[in-house]
Amino acid sequence: IWELKKDVYVVELDWYPDAPGEMVVLTCDTPEEDGITWTLDQSSEVLGSGKTLTIQVKEFGDAGQYTCHKGGEVLSHSLLLLHKKEDGIWSTDILKDQKEPKNKTFLRCEAKNYSGRFTCWWLTTISTDLTFSVKSSRGSSDPQGVTCGAATLSAERVRGDNKEYEYSVECQEDSACPAAEESLPIEVMVDAVHKLKYENYTSSFFIRDIIKPDPPKNLQLKPLKNSRQVEVSWEYPDTWSTPHSYFSLTFCVQVQGKSKREKKDRVFTDKTSATVICRKNASISVRAQDRYYSSSWSEWASVPCS
Amino acid sequence: RNLPVATPDPGMFPCLHHSQNLLRAVSNMLQKARQTLEFYPCTSEEIDHEDITKDKTSTVEACLPLELTKNESCLNSRETSFITNGSCLASRKTSFMMALCLSSIYEDLKMYQVEFKTMNAKLLMDPKRQIFLDQNMLAVIDELMQALNFNSETVPQKSSLEEPDFYKTKIKLCILLHAFRIRAVTIDRVMSYLNAS
């Protein structure tokens, strides 16, 4: 058993049929010695008396808020949560496996630049009685500070019969140099509590590996005389690291109709303009990627050909 | 420690092309190592990230773009002194800081060159003959060093009398390639910045 936060404790249980469970001793936070009784949740049934209560925790029915009283007055609470271990593996029931970039990916993180600011998100089908808390650091043995905000519900989607909820959190490394060469990864830890179930999820990454620039901005077209060709120009996104001559981007320019199966024109360039062939009912799209370290491409910025 | 804005004309900056070749060569070599050594811990997630130049050179700090010198997190206080007469310095106006930056890059290359050559000598003794260093990568390191053209004491190639542990050597190769790729990215960024300034 360990303390998650004040008056909240996590009991780690091997989860299998007829498992013996864990013996837990609760102590009432009071100077009083006599006349103390214990109850669980809303029940008025007295579970025991005395300053300490010993219980055998085997299942979710044994978890919950234990309260010690004296003469009708509440003295203190202890909330017990369960963390299940099945076949040596901690349960991952609360969050959905996003399967990208690999299986068992519960947390996904992205950074728009090298400033040390990043966003992580996760998915669940649970809508109520759910709380998250996020901690992060650079390295684990001698951790350096990363400050994370509160996790918030950022999107709701309908997937078949189920509703899917996306939560996200923003974090900022306390003293980040955009030009630094990372040798210790960022560690992100998410504590998830659903009713009386506790789970924790972690992700470890270098900022350089989770870079995904914003799409290029200010796309403009200029038709070329006596030609089917069009000059398309754009600018670096405002959120990208500066100076741009140091943090350079490379671009992919594509002309395509509405269907992915349609024919297309595609060209890669390090410049902020390119010449392509425009077709009726097609769009010109441009996306960006770090020129020197190939992490993710940005989303497309698009303008119609016409 | 930072790069001033007054730097050579773009046409006068021969190191940019060499640095691009360097990044390409080390990226290809790292990809080849990851494929060939697929049953060894050779991915970014699996290896320890070591920097053999730590406390010996200060390339990131010495080559910091002017715009980032206002960022206190970028101003590390590591002090290192370097020789300052390079041929990539195509303008007499080139500042002392830029010379310091380029000579720090030169020292990095020299250190990695020695490590890679020592390692290759060991790998050539491996009866499995599983992986060797790409001669193109070694040649590209050499070309960039020649373009930088700093006078510097030659570092003797390390020779080891004991029987090499090929498993450890291959893991060290992965660690070295990952670190060198990161440094090559920095070098490429620096050369691009100098070329544009």
């Epitope: 199966r261 297309k264 060209v267 | -």
Partner: antibody, heavy 118, light 107 residues
Framework: QVQLVQSGAEVKKPGSSVKVSCKAS????????LHWSRQAPGQGLEWMGW????????EYAPKFQGRVTITADESTSTAYMELSSLRSEDTAVYYC???????????WGQGTLVTVSS | DIVMTQSPLSLPVTPGEPASISCRAS??????LHWYQQKPGQAPRQLIA???QSISGVPSRFSGSGSGTDFTLTISSLQPEDFATYMC?????????FGQGTKVEIK
């Protein structure tokens, strides 16, 4: 299986014209750009131009502008390349090639030898 | 027009050995570079797209690298069927242009 089948070899006199055909099978004809290139004996490939069979749009290499005409007939899934004012240096194997991507080629025809000789 | 220069023009190689062919562009073309194989009397066959993207059905011994002006096609271990002429082609701008070809011959 996508295939491009070209017409047979031709011998032409200088100053005349030649029209080479390229019939596509497998896949929808108008879903692809169609290009023509040529290869003179012992030389590298030389790109001549492309057509979008869907709308008849064409683009030619400046070297051949005014001398080459590329057309397409959707009903027969056939593209044509006509080269006029032939000279001896036009002796080459002419290839058609196609792709959904405009600027490179994933399937090629077998080639048509055009010999220009007096 | 962008001029594509291949080297060497002829490359004698022992079967089973690796081979590398270089292609240089007269100006920067990013990764807009494609490789083809051509055997005598046959049409070219696509090997690599955009400098390094492998094509389905092409053996994994063929790989491409490079960007900007310098590109390389590598055959890790030459098989008897690989003796042919290899050509690069730039797609950075029209007119599309090809290298003059490198003939890989049996040593």
């Amino acid at each position: 299986q996508v295939q491009l089948v070209q017409s047979g070899a031709e011998v032409k006199k200088p100053g005349s014209s030649v029209k080479v055909s390229c019939k596509a099978s497998g896949g929808t004809f108008s879903d692809y750009y169609l290009h023509w290139s040529r290869q003179a004996p012992g030389q590298g490939l030389e790109w001549m131009g492309w057509i979008d069979p869907e709308n008849g749009d064409t683009e030619y290499a400046p070297k051949f502008q005014g001398r080459v005409t590329i057309t397409a007939d959707e009903s027969t899934s056939t593209a044509y390349m006509e080269l006029s004012s032939l000279r001896s240096e036009d002796t080459a194997v002419y290839y058609c090639a196609r792709n959904k991507e405009l600027r490179y080629f994933d399937v090629w025809g077998q080639g048509t030898l055009v010999t220009v000789s007096s | 027009d962008i001029v594509m220069t291949q080297s060497p023009l002829s490359l004698p190689v022992t079967p089973g050995e690796p081979a590398s062919i270089s292609c240089r562009a007269s100006q920067s073309i990013s990764i807009n570079l494609h490789w083809y194989q051509q055997k005598p009397g046959q049409a070219p066959r696509q090997l690599i797209a955009f400098a390094s993207q492998s094509i389905s059905g092409v053996p994994s011994r063929f790989s491409g690298s490079g960007s900007g002006t310098d590109f390389t096609l590598t055959i890790s271990s030459l098989q008897p069927e690989d003796f042919a002429t290899y050509m690069c082609q730039q797609s950075n701008s029209f007119p599309l242009t090809f290298g003059q070809g490198t003939k890989v011959e049996i040593k």
